[in-house]
């Protein structure tokens, strides 16, 4: 039994880091493998993660980590019974993938303005809470070419756009994702999308 693709890990910088790897053949990850992880600091605690299958030869492990700080650095040991298959390290602050924003809502009752709001996925005491910026994706269900991205570079989790920038009488969907420049994170997953029917009063044209 050998590791074909070494574990790569990302942290949500809150409570979970996710490590994925591939074995050289079909593997029952949960019965055959264990991923041991421990902070490099003296007197730290040792923890064991039981991996799950992620495709035939793929494995994924969700490492519990309350209270992540930038100084944290973990040793990782992948074991198959008594055999050490791989040894590595992981610094969560250098591999951050933020949690996806939630509760995306489109408010259509503001005159000819669409207000999109969503929730910051972090609690106020988490470092990332005040460092997230967002990308909002809006697209038409009827027209694949009608697809746009709005970058929200301020901290408030909301976006206002004129309803007239979108076509009237058409259904649209929106979703949002987050990233944090301070830790040079990857983008989060997209939030679940939300749907609305775009309608607004066309301005009266005089000829």
């Amino acid at each position: 039994m050998k590791v074909l693709q070494e574990p790569t890990c990302v942290s949500d910088y809150m409570s979970i880091s996710t490590c994925e790897w591939k074995m050289n053949g079909p593997t029952n990850c949960s019965t055959e493998l264990r991923l041991l992880y421990q902070l490099v600091f003296l007197l730290s605690e040792a923890h064991t993660c039981i991996p799950e299958n992620n495709g035939g030869a793929g494995c994924v492990c969700h490492l519990l980590m309350d209270d992540v700080v930038s100084a944290d650095n973990y040793t990782l040991d992948l074991w198959a019974g008594q055999q050490l298959l791989w040894k590595g390290s992981f610094k969560p602050s250098e591999h951050v993938k933020p949690r996806a924003p939630g509760n995306l809502t489109v408010h259509t009752n503001v005159s000819d303005t669409l207000l999109l709001t969503w929730s910051n996925p972090y609690p106020p005491d988490n470092y990332l809470y005040n460092h997230l910026t967002y990308a909002v994706n809006i697209w038409s269900e009827n027209d694949p070419a009608d697809f746009r991205i709005y970058n929200v570079t301020y901290l408030e989790p909301s976006l206002r756009i004129a309803a007239s920038t979108l076509k009237s009488g058409i259904s649209y969907r929106a979703r949002v994702r987050a990233w944090a420049q301070c830790y040079n994170t990857t983008w989060s997953e997209w939030s679940p999308s939300t749907k609305w029917h775009n309608s607004y009063r066309e301005p009266f044209e005089q000829h």
Partner: antibody, heavy 120, light 111 residues
Framework: EVQLIESGGGLVQPKGSLKLSCAAS????????MDWVRQAPGKGLEWVAR??????????NYADSVKDRFTISRDDSQSMVYLQMINLKTEDTAMYYC???????????WGQGTLVSVSA | DIVVTQSPASLAVSLGQRATISCRAS??????????MHWYQQKPGQPPKLLIY???NLESGVPARFSGSGSGTDFTLNIHPVEEEDVAIYYC?????????FGAGTKLELK
């Protein structure tokens, strides 16, 4: 939000016994070592005892001043840590804090403490 | 056991000035790139509060006027500029090995 709430302190005579409890919440209790730190009135801080997590085989360690008299234990199912104290001495009089480390053994979270007075 | 000696025992500083507190360990508390010395602040009737961990890392929510430095056996806590709310007792603590030991404390007062 991490919370540590101590109870069980009180007035006890020399050579008496007392059991302190600490109820923990707001974190994954079974991942952490837990410690007791005490502070005699008007004095400094003294580490008393530590119990490690299951991943470290629930190993226990004690300050020399309390060895063989104090026993630290934990109940992960209830998120509780205990300090059983026997053969108490007047010099054990102190505020006893339940503390949780972060990382190795620096203490990011402290309870409000429970006061133990040993006096005839 | 590692003995941690803290100085001075008390310190009076004017508002806006710098307070410097020192800690010396009886043997090195640094290894593998980390220095296992930490600093706490304690106000009357309250439990201690973590300020600095691993010699120089500022705990979340602690004002940037607090800073820590040092390695090996000698460590320093600096507070600059000192504010009224900083009046307290400050303790250092090592975690190089068990038993964990604290310094005796430094009482910071205002001039």
């Amino acid at each position: 939000e991490v919370q540590l709430i101590e109870s069980g302190g009180g007035l006890v005579q020399p050579k008496g016994s007392l059991k302190l409890s600490c109820a923990a919440s707001g974190f994954t209790f079974n991942m952490y070592a837990m410690d007791w730190v005490r502070q005699a009135p008007g004095k400094g801080l003294e580490w008393v005892a530590r119990i490690r997590s299951k991943g470290s085989n629930f190993e226990t360690n004690y300050a020399d001043s309390v060895k063989d008299r104090f026993t630290i234990s934990r109940d992960d199912s209830q998120s509780m840590v205990y300090l059983q104290m026997i053969n108490l001495k007047t010099e054990d009089t102190a505020m006893y804090y339940c503390v949780r480390h972060r990382g190795g053994a620096w203490f990011a979270y402290w309870g409000q403490g429970t006061l133990v007075s040993v006096s005839a | 056991d590692i003995v941690v000696t803290q100085s001075p025992a008390s310190l009076a500083v004017s508002l806006g000035q710098r307070a410097t507190i020192s800690c010396r360990a009886s043997k090195s508390v640094s290894t593998s790139g980390y220095s296992y010395m930490h600093w706490y602040q304690q106000k009357p009737g309250q439990p201690p509060k973590l300020l600095i961990y691993l010699a120089s890392n500022l705990e979340s929510g602690v004002p940037a006027r607090f800073s820590g430095s040092g390695s090996g056996t000698d460590f320093t806590l600096n507070i600059h500029p000192v504010e009224e709310e900083d009046v307290a007792i400050y303790y250092c603590q090592h975690s190089r090995e068990l038993p964990l030991t604290f310094g005796a404390g430094t009482k910071l007062e205002l001039k």
